[in-house]
Interface confidence: low
């Protein structure tokens, strides 16, 4: 049978030939009677066999990383007979590894981001080198990682390539680091090959800095005439952090009057001090307020870095302005009874100069020629007032400072004219009254009512009476209904159109005012030929024909 051991050939041998081993048959007695042959890929070119001894040699330099094993076939022939001594057999030559490949970092470039101030041991990134040598052959592909650059901030786990933080770093001092990692094969023993890679490690920001005011004191001025919302000035704090961690908010700490507010300019991160309420130089000429600044977003674990928030003192000087006069009241309601003679005092308005110099006032009145005003602000009537003409007057009083006539203010003055009983009641309408010739005694001729132009605090009550002077007129009688109406009744049966076509009845109407006023009113009653119907509806037309000279039967 065949006799051989496992065949190995080291790669990258520089010798012209290298003995690998011997192929032999146990029938070979050394008499040089057998011929050994090598067949298969590489036979004759890469590997040669001594046909006498069966010794195999490699005659070419081999690269295990290109090809790690060769499968060949062996034959042994009896030279004398030409027959095979042993059956053809397959065998393997393994190319044994030498450390001829350095570790390579295939995933370059490496870049990692890690939060600043991360504790020791924090994992940053894992770098992995590959070694083309045989991992099963000794230590040729067993790698050890070490740090060439990056101490004392980083360390690398020798066997895993895991980079960890070994010292806390402050982004505000340095925001990125170049770390150089070396990978050595042969677990770092002599003859090891190495490769290096650079890792860019960027520190991401954490909110470990509180904002601090640039100035401890700010001085601003504001005109007392400035409207609410006016920007008074800008304050500025700086924060070494970036992005969201530098976002800040300002607030006012000491401002009991709640006159000022601070809003933030999101573009510049400046605090804009604005007016929240109107200021008055004469009331307070300066304000001292304290502003505080803090970050908008603070993680709980970083809260200790944000205690004792930065503050600044702001002095706001109020500038005096020449202000227009100020009326004591926003508007005035004055009252006067009607019927008073002209020159009657209605009331007084008053305006003052809010400024320190206290300019005297001059007053002007518009809105009605029925009133005038003097320099004391006293309003008087220029005519007798009649409530029934106008019950209210809407006046405007203008005050100007005598020292500066440009400074003007106005106030509305509403004058209410009170009613007095100066109007007697009268018929509420014109009555066209008819009585039929054939009217009977007690028949209703007319119902009358009255009106009074005066205003009544309570309801008007009118009293109707037949004038005592009207003694010759007994054909009709008046009855007061006690409801502000009265009824006129026929006091006889039958009237004669031809003899007495018209009757005039004098009626007195009195009101319930104090004192009471009474009016005398005449009711004209026309006699009408109504026919059998005793209906006066057609009397108006007949009266019209009668007046025009026609006569109807």
């Amino acid at each position: 049978g065949w006799v051989w051991n496992q065949f190995f050939v080291p790669e990258e041998m520089n010798t012209t030939s290298h003995h690998i081993g011997q192929l032999r048959s146990d029938l070979d007695n050394g008499n040089n009677s057998f011929q050994y042959k090598l067949l298969g890929a590489g036979a004759g070119s890469t590997f040669i066999i001594d046909e006498r001894t069966g010794d195999i040699y490699a005659i070419q330099k081999l690269d295990r990383e290109e090809r790690s094993l060769y499968i060949l076939r062996a034959q042994v022939i009896d030279i004398a007979t030409g027959r095979a001594v042993e059956p053809e057999s397959e065998f393997v030559i393994k190319v044994s590894d030498i450390n001829d490949n350095e570790p390579k970092f295939l995933d370059e470039p490496y870049e990692a981001i890690v939060p600043e101030m991360s504790p020791e041991g924090t994992l940053v990134i894992q770098v992995t080198a590959s070694d083309a040598d045989d991992p099963s052959s000794g230590n040729n592909a067993r790698l050890l990682y070490s740090l060439l650059q990056g101490q004392p901030y980083f360390s690398v786990e020798p066997t895993t390539g895991v980079i960890r933080i070994s010292s806390k770093m402050d982004r505000e001092l340095q925001d990125e680091y170049w770390v150089i990692i070396q990978a050595k094969d042969m677990i770092g023993q002599p003859g090891a090959l190495s490769g290096t890679t650079s890792v860019l490690i960027k520190l991401s920001d954490v909110n470990d800095n509180k904002p601090i005011f640039k100035e401890s004191f700010y001085r601003f001025t504001i005109s007392e005439s400035a409207p609410i919302g006016t920007s008074i000035g800008k304050i500025m704090a700086y924060d070494d952090d970036i992005g969201e961690n530098a976002e800040m908010e300002y607030s006012i700490e000491d401002d009991d009057s709640k006159i000022f507010d601070i809003i933030i300019d999101n573009d510049t991160q400046e605090g804009i001090v604005i007016l929240k309420k109107k200021v008055d130089f004469e009331q307070q000429s300066y304000y001292g307020i304290r502003a505080k600044v803090k970050n908008c977003h603070v993680d709980e674990e970083l809260a200790p870095a944000h205690v004792n928030a930065s503050t600044t003192y702001i002095k706001v000087q109020v500038e005096d302005e020449d202000e227009p006069p100020v009326f004591l009241l926003p508007y005035y309601i004055l009252e006067i009874p009607e019927g008073k003679p002209y020159g009657t005092i209605v009331g007084t308005v008053s305006a003052t100069d809010p400024d320190r110099r206290q300019s005297p006032m001059r007053y002007y009145l518009t809105g009605s020629k029925m009133f005038d005003i003097n320099d004391n602000g006293t309003i008087i009537t220029t005519n007798m007032l009649d409530r029934e003409v106008s019950a209210w007057y809407n006046l405007t009083v203008t005050a100007t400072e005598t020292y500066n006539v440009q400074q003007i203010s106005s106030a509305h003055v509403y004058v209410q004219v009170f009613n007095i009983n100066d109007n007697a009641p009268e018929f509420s309408q014109f009555y066209e009254t008819y009585v039929c010739e054939n009217a009977e005694s007690g028949e209703i001729v007319q119902i009358i009512s009255a009106i009074d132009r005066d205003e009544s605090i309570e309801d008007h009550h009118f009293y109707f009476n037949h004038s005592l002077e009207d003694t010759n007129n007994s054909s009709f009688m008046l009855t007061d209904n006690q409801d502000n109406t009265a009824v006129i009744l026929s006091n006889r049966t039958g009237f004669n159109l031809k003899e007495e076509p018209v009757f005039y009845m004098i009626i007195l109407i009195a009101d319930n005012g104090i004192p009471s006023l009474t009016s005398t009113n005449t009711l004209t009653i026309q006699v009408c030929d109504c026919g059998d119907s005793r209906n006066t509806e057609t009397c108006a037309n007949k009266g019209l024909l009668f007046i025009m000279g026609f006569r109807t039967e």
Partner: antibody
């Protein structure tokens, strides 16, 4: 300079578990191998086992079934647990450092703790 | 396991004399991975020699180590009073690591 300090109870009852901790100060626990060695009273030294900072261990086969060595890199500490103790485990227990990288797989113990005496008794 | 046998068990010498301590291994110690330690009462062992012959940092040059394979020697060329202690050899070429039983060097 690196210093080692053993700590743990000085008295353990038989059949219970002996627990010791070694605190490394003055340097990092990383990149070195850390061993436990014991010395019974009046006797020689016996290697118990080592741990690498990534957690890989190698124990003396004579104690392997009862020994657990663990590491806590955040505290710079490594610990020994020896279960089912008997009076034969009464000894002075040392922690020590050896560096794998200076020569071959193991190296001599260049830094030792001062030792802690553990007595196994009921 | 590799068994290390130290001889003599006790060595009585005077200061100024030369001390020779022997350590024999039950099988060859790979790579001459053998160390020597000195231990004084109440103290932890102190590394003297590693790799059979390399002096540890801070060890006086009167201490020297030699040997390979199975036979190793620690020599103290001129004994000082502070050298009197127990000396242990240790092999770390093959797991498990083992120690010799120790040689007590005492003052005569």
């Amino acid at each position: 300079q690196v210093q080692l300090q053993e700590s743990g109870p000085g008295l353990v009852k038989p059949s219970e578990t002996l627990s010791l901790t070694c605190t490394v100060s003055g340097g990092s626990i990383n990149s070195y191998y850390w061993s436990w060695i014991r010395q019974p009273p009046g006797k020689g030294l016996e290697w118990i086992g080592y741990i690498y900072y990534i957690g890989s261990t190698n124990y003396n086969p004579s104690l392997k079934s009862r020994v657990t060595i663990s590491v806590d890199t955040s505290k710079n500490q490594f610990s020994l647990k020896l279960s089912s103790v008997t009076a034969a485990d009464t000894a002075l227990y040392y922690c020590a450092r050896d560096s794998r990288y200076r020569s071959g797989w193991y190296d001599a113990f260049d830094i030792w703790g001062q030792g802690t005496m553990v007595t196994v008794s009921s | 396991d590799i068994v290390l046998t130290q001889s003599p068990g006790t060595l009585s010498l005077s200061p100024g004399e030369r001390a020779t301590l022997s350590c024999r291994a039950s099988q060859s110690v790979a790579g001459s991975y053998l160390a020597w330690y000195q231990q004084k009462p109440g103290q932890a062992p102190r590394l003297l020699i590693s790799g059979a012959s390399s002096r540890a940092t801070g060890i006086p040059d009167r201490f020297s180590g030699s040997g390979s394979g199975t036979d190793f020697t620690l020599t103290i060329s001129r004994l000082e009073p502070e050298d009197f202690a127990v000396y242990y050899c240790q092999q770390y070429g093959k797991s498990p690591i083992t120690f010799g039983q120790g040689t007590r060097l005492e003052m005569k």
